[in-house]
């Protein structure tokens, strides 16, 4: 059988290294050797490359080497496949070296900010040594912030006459570390160099970008003062490296600025004690270069009716996220504040919050929350400066079986009845939503019975027991992950009724 006709010929010119062609099929059933015929010097000269020996047989690739690699040039290539039965020739293909030239990557030697020019990095590089001197090179500059996985790209060209191998990358974030990598190719070529080694640079620091501001309103104290826990953090989009030297807070009752109080702190939280009126609170952060824009918060009067617009809320889990969605009756509300914290028996040690805009859902990566912990999630509607009634739900990112079963006791033991009561498992040991309880009971040497009740039931009366009989009993609490038995108890039914 004749060899297959060589097809899909693809050639690439590795500048000053070789000119390599590949083709298909890569493997033949019988031993096949290949001859690649070439014309070069604009058709004036010809030569061949061959896989004519056993070590290279069936390799669908051949390389032409210097000194006959001429550039610029047009090459003609034809591949012949030969086996014991005969020869098959490919179609003739034509290659303009400028269009298939691949050169070495450039080498970035500095990525620096330029004094006084904000949000810009100047990249300097060394043009690859193995690149045609006179050609215009096109470049792709890839860049990303150091903690991001997503690359952005910018394309540009440089004439050889420029000799100025620099590029000013603008519209960056202030005081942010960027990773840069660069590739290049002759302007006419379809083949890019590899990427250069990555280099890191940091944009100049500026005055702080801004703050996100929130509060927790606590119940009024006996003397009528209201504790308000203020909290703030760098605004979304602020530079990762940004550091504030401190924070200035000032606040006053609505329409009474001459009662302004000021506080300076280096913390990101501060407790205010306010009267029952409406208050306005302002916070700025500052560093050596200036102040951030002002973050503003209105604290409603104690007796103010807050609006309610969230009608329902659902929390669901995807493969790697917790997604909370809500429905609202107020289309004009497009900003929401989400709070989340662990539902523990003691004061929550960690309290988190985040603003959501132009969406009615909020997502968080599962790995940002602890498995087996119940989280309280509240969503507040925010309409301009007004904060509405929150809607709350609870969620686990991963449920497990309870760490302990219910503590059970037998009450009101009768001749044929007994009332079983059990305590709720402490929050820290539930490891999931308790969906039901199952009571297992068994007379001495008798058959085991069970009864399952809803999670809101903590007491159950067993009937139709046998008089004057010893029973063992335990209650199992179950989550979606499974159940855990409580301590086993024993009781004995009475022989006669006791009134």
């Amino acid at each position: 059988v004749l060899p297959a006709k060589p097809e899909n010929i693809s050639c690439i010119f590795y500048y000053e290294e070789n000119f390599t062609c590949t083709w298909s099929p890569e493997k033949e059933a019988s031993y096949t050797w290949y001859k690649v015929k070439r014309t070069y010097s604009y058709g004036y000269k010809s030569d061949i490359c061959s896989t004519d020996n056993s070590t290279r047989g069936n390799h669908a690739s051949c390389s032409f080497l210097p000194p006959t690699i001429t550039n610029p040039d047009n090459y003609t290539i034809q591949v012949e496949a030969q086996n014991a039965d005969g020869i098959m020739k490919s179609d003739i293909t034509y290659w303009n070296l400028d269009a298939i030239m691949k050169i070495e990557p450039p080498e970035i030697f500095s990525v620096k900010s330029v004094l006084g020019i904000k949000r810009m990095l100047q990249i300097k590089w060394i043009r690859p040594v193995l690149a045609p001197h006179s050609s215009t090179l096109k470049y792709t500059l890839r860049f990303r912030t150091i903690n991001s996985a997503y690359w952005m790209e910018v394309n540009f060209t440089k004439e050889d006459i420029d000799r100025d191998e620099t590029y000013n990358l603008t519209e960056l974030q202030a005081f942010t570390e960027y990773v840069m990598t660069l590739r290049c190719a002759p302007a006419e070529s379809m083949f890019w160099s590899g990427w250069s080694q990555e280099k890191v640079g940091t944009t100049e620091e500026e005055a702080p970008y801004g703050l996100d501001l929130w509060r927790v309103l606590k119940p009024a104290m006996v003397d009528g003062r209201r504790p308000v826990q203020l909290m703030w953090k760098k605004a979304t989009g602020a530079p990762v490296l940004e550091k504030a030297l401190g924070y200035n807070i000032w606040y006053f009752p609505e329409n009474n600025t001459n009662l302004t109080e000021t506080v300076n702190t280096t913390n990101q939280t501060h407790e205010l004690y306010l009267g029952g009126k409406t208050y306005w609170v302002y916070v700025v952060s500052y560093n050596s270069l200036g102040e951030s824009p002002v973050a503003t918060l209105r604290i409603p009067a104690l007796n103010e009716k807050t609006f309610q617009c969230i009608e329902a809320m659902q929390a669901c889990l995807t493969q790697d996220q917790l997604v909370v969605e809500w429905q609202s009756s107020a289309p004009e509300v497009d900003t929401w504040m989400v709070e989340w914290f662990p539902d523990v028996d003691s004061e929550p040690s960690s309290f988190s919050w985040e603003s959501v805009s132009q969406a009615r859902n909020w997502t968080i990566q599962k790995d940002e929350l602890k498995p087996l912990w119940c989280y309280n999630i509240s969503v507040y509607p925010v309409l301009r400066d007004r904060v509405g009634q929150p809607y709350s739900t609870q969620a686990y990112v991963q449920e497990g079986i309870p760490s302990a079963g219910p503590v059970t006791q037998a009450d009101s033991i009768g001749v044929k009845t007994v009332t079983i009561t059990w305590k709720e498992i402490p929050k820290s040991k539930r490891n999931g939503f308790i969906k039901n309880y199952t009571i297992f009971y068994q007379a001495e040497d008798g058959k085991e019975f069970s009864k399952t009740v809803n999670s809101n039931i903590l007491q159950y009366r067993l009937e139709s027991l046998t008089r004057r009989t010893s029973y063992s009993l335990q209650v199992m609490a179950s989550t979606n992950a499974g159940g855990t038995n409580g301590t086993k108890i024993n009781f004995k039914t009475l022989s006669i009724s006791v009134l």
Partner: antibody, heavy 131, light 108 residues
Framework: EVQLVESGGDLVKPGGSLRLSCVAS????????MSWVRQAPGKGLQWVSG????????GYADAVKGRFTISRDNARNTVYLQMNSLRAEDTAVYYC????????????????????????WGQGTLVTVSS | EVVMIQTPLSLSVSPGEPASISCRAS???????LVWYLQKPGQSPQLLIY???SRATGVSDRFSGSGSGTDFTLRISRVEAEDVGVYYC?????????FGQGTKVEIK
């Protein structure tokens, strides 16, 4: 037997045209470049034009550039020389010659240098340009 | 174009004597692209030497070639009667390919 047979030579008036043909046999025609070489009466050899195996023109002598055109038909194993605007100084025996084969000169490994020469020649065809 | 100058233009040699023909190029030529041909009286030219020094199939070892750059030489160690004819050098390095003007070898 490897053979080249030229035809088409004739007596033609200045400014006239002529097409020479060279039929090849005994070898795989499309593996080889072909050339036309001429020899004026009592003079030396002059390379006229050449065509590579792929059908690309190798070039023309300065004296014939713009007037002569070389071509090949691999299906017919034939190379042609179209001669226009003929002049008295084009009078010569025109030889068809085969370029060296695409082999030889193994450099070691898989790459082969190509040495250039005309290894097979036809018997020639006479072109006379005269009024 | 590259001009090839042969010297001498004619050469009369006694049988058994050596002979030498020089070919000088107007610019450097790669040794791979320098060829010698012999045209015997009344015949088409035939290949003698290619790549400056490689003998063509069937060519006597009395013929040898050498040189590089712009100066190339063809030597016949012992001339025989069958060696008469015109010897041409040719370069392939640049277009157009060009021949020397020829050297006529005769037997004394």
């Amino acid at each position: 037997e490897v053979q080249l047979v030229e035809s088409g030579g004739d007596l033609v008036k200045p400014g006239g045209s002529l097409r020479l043909s060279c039929v090849a046999s005994g070898f795989t025609f499309d593996d080889y470049g072909m050339s036309w070489v001429r020899q004026a009466p009592g003079k030396g050899l002059q390379w006229v034009s050449g065509i590579n195996w792929a059908g690309g023109t190798i070039g023309y002598a300065d004296a014939v550039k713009g007037r002569f055109t070389i071509s090949r038909d691999n299906a017919r194993n034939t190379v042609y020389l179209q001669m226009n605007s003929l002049r008295a100084e084009d009078t010569a025996v025109y030889y068809c010659a085969r370029e060296s084969p695409l082999r030889l000169g193994d450099l070691g490994g898989d790459y082969f240098y190509y040495y250039y020469y005309l290894d097979v020649w036809g018997q020639g065809t006479l072109v006379t340009v005269s009024s | 174009e590259v001009v090839m100058i042969q010297t001498p233009l004619s050469l009369s040699v006694s049988p058994g004597e050596p002979a030498s023909i020089s070919c000088r190029a107007s610019q450097s030529v790669s040794s791979r692209y320098l060829v010698w041909y012999l045209q015997k009286p009344g015949q088409s030219p035939q290949l003698l030497i290619y790549g400056t020094s490689s003998r063509a199939t069937g060519v006597s070892d009395r013929f040898s070639g050498s040189g590089s750059g712009t100066d190339f030489t063809l030597r016949i160690s012992r001339v025989e009667a069958e060696d008469v004819g015109v010897y041409y050098c040719q370069q392939y390095d640049n277009s157009p390919r060009t021949f020397g003007q020829g050297t006529k070898v005769e037997i004394k």
